[in-house]
């Protein structure tokens, strides 16, 4: 959610705005809800269909290979670097994802399945 400060006399000073939610399907006209204390506000918004159909996710990352298993946490990690973002999506430049360690055979199978994918 986005926070924005609006100073207009005695009006609310900091509104938090949610995402634009289309009224039907996954694009087109919809509403964005804002809250400030006990106040709420709904504004019309639009998710252009040519953004949604080109790529489903707002943020696409290119991932490195999974790192070694960390015995203390039982997880392994890999880093992703931003590859492409929807024009208005405020994506992190890099992200770090973790997953539980599995047995060697499972790991190999998963690695083969995921090969070549971002």
């Amino acid at each position: 959610k986005k926070k924005e400060k609006v100073k207009k006399g005695s009006e609310c000073s900091e509104w938090t705005w949610g995402p634009c939610t289309p009224s039907s399907k996954d694009c087109g006209m919809g509403f964005r809800e804002g809250t400030c204390g006990a106040q709420t506000q709904r504004v019309h918004c639009k998710v252009p269909c040519n953004w949604k159909k080109e790529f489903g996710a707002d943020c696409k990352y290119k991932f490195e290979s999974w790192g070694a298993c960390d015995g203390s946490t039982g997880t392994k990690a890999r880093q992703g670097t931003l590859k492409k973002a929807r024009y208005n999506a405020q994506c992190q430049e890099t992200i770090r994802v973790t997953k539980p360690c599995t047995s060697k055979t499972k790991s190999k199978t998963k690695a083969k399945k995921g090969k070549g994918k971002d």
Partner: antibody, heavy 117, light 107 residues
């Protein structure tokens, strides 16, 4: 930070074509949308279109569909604007800018294209 | 396409005064509105993105409000270096469009 250096402008005769270059240095050229904007002398800003270097997805202002072609060369960290069938009204300063919704944008210095016989 | 109308076309102020620049969209554009400053012979410079989000390196005297159709750029106390042309731009739908600009001049 991204630095954008533009080149390729100059005097061109009506009906001719011109290719403008926008060379990027610094981080992550390929991750961000590259916009092209022009500004006629003494006038406002006009968006031509944009291209994403990662896959060359291009979105063009329909006004320029028969006039402009956008391309990129990731190996050279460069974006290009090809302008065809130039006319006097295409005389303008042309800008490239790299856009990130998270951090904002970076602009080239602009390059002047003068169309005259 | 979405039309952005900026007012006033020219704003004459003295340094130290408060500047209020308006940008009205022909339809709701949520908060997908950005403000630029342009000085003669220079490229535009982004001041505010998404109606009210500040940009690194831009002085705190610049602020913006929205969302919807009516947007405002406020300069709390105008400095001599602020005299320039200001443009709003929408990124809600294609084509991206700019307002006609507001020239902030010294009174």
């Amino acid at each position: 930070q991204v630095q954008l250096v533009q080149s390729g402008g100059g005097l061109v005769k009506p009906g001719h074509s011109l290719r403008l270059s926008c060379a990027a240095s610094g981080q992550s050229f390929s991750s961000y949308w590259m916009n092209w904007v022009r500004q006629a002398p003494g006038k406002g800003l006009e968006w031509i279109g944009m291209i994403h270097p990662s896959d060359s997805e291009t979105i063009l202002n329909q006004k320029f569909k028969d006039k402009a072609t956008l391309s990129v060369d990731i190996a050279k960290n460069s974006a290009y604007l090809q302008m065809n069938s130039l006319r006097a009204e295409d005389t303008a300063v042309y800008y490239c800018s790299s856009w990130s919704a998270k951090r904002g944008d970076f602009w080239g210095q602009g390059t002047l294209v003068t169309v005259s016989s | 396409e979405i039309v952005l109308t900026q007012s006033p076309a020219t704003l004459s102020l003295s340094p130290g005064e408060r500047a209020t620049l308006s940008c009205r969209a022909s339809e709701s554009i949520s908060n997908n509105l950005h403000w630029y400053q342009q000085k003669p012979g220079q490229a535009p410079r982004l001041l505010i993105k998404y109606a009210s989000q500040s940009i690194s390196g831009i002085p705190a005297r610049f602020s913006g409000s929205g969302p919807g159709t009516d947007f405002t750029l406020t300069i709390s106390s105008v400095e001599p270096e602020d005299f320039a042309v200001y443009y709003c731009q929408q990124s809600n739908s294609w084509p991206l469009t700019f307002g006609g600009g507001t020239k902030l001049e010294i009174k």
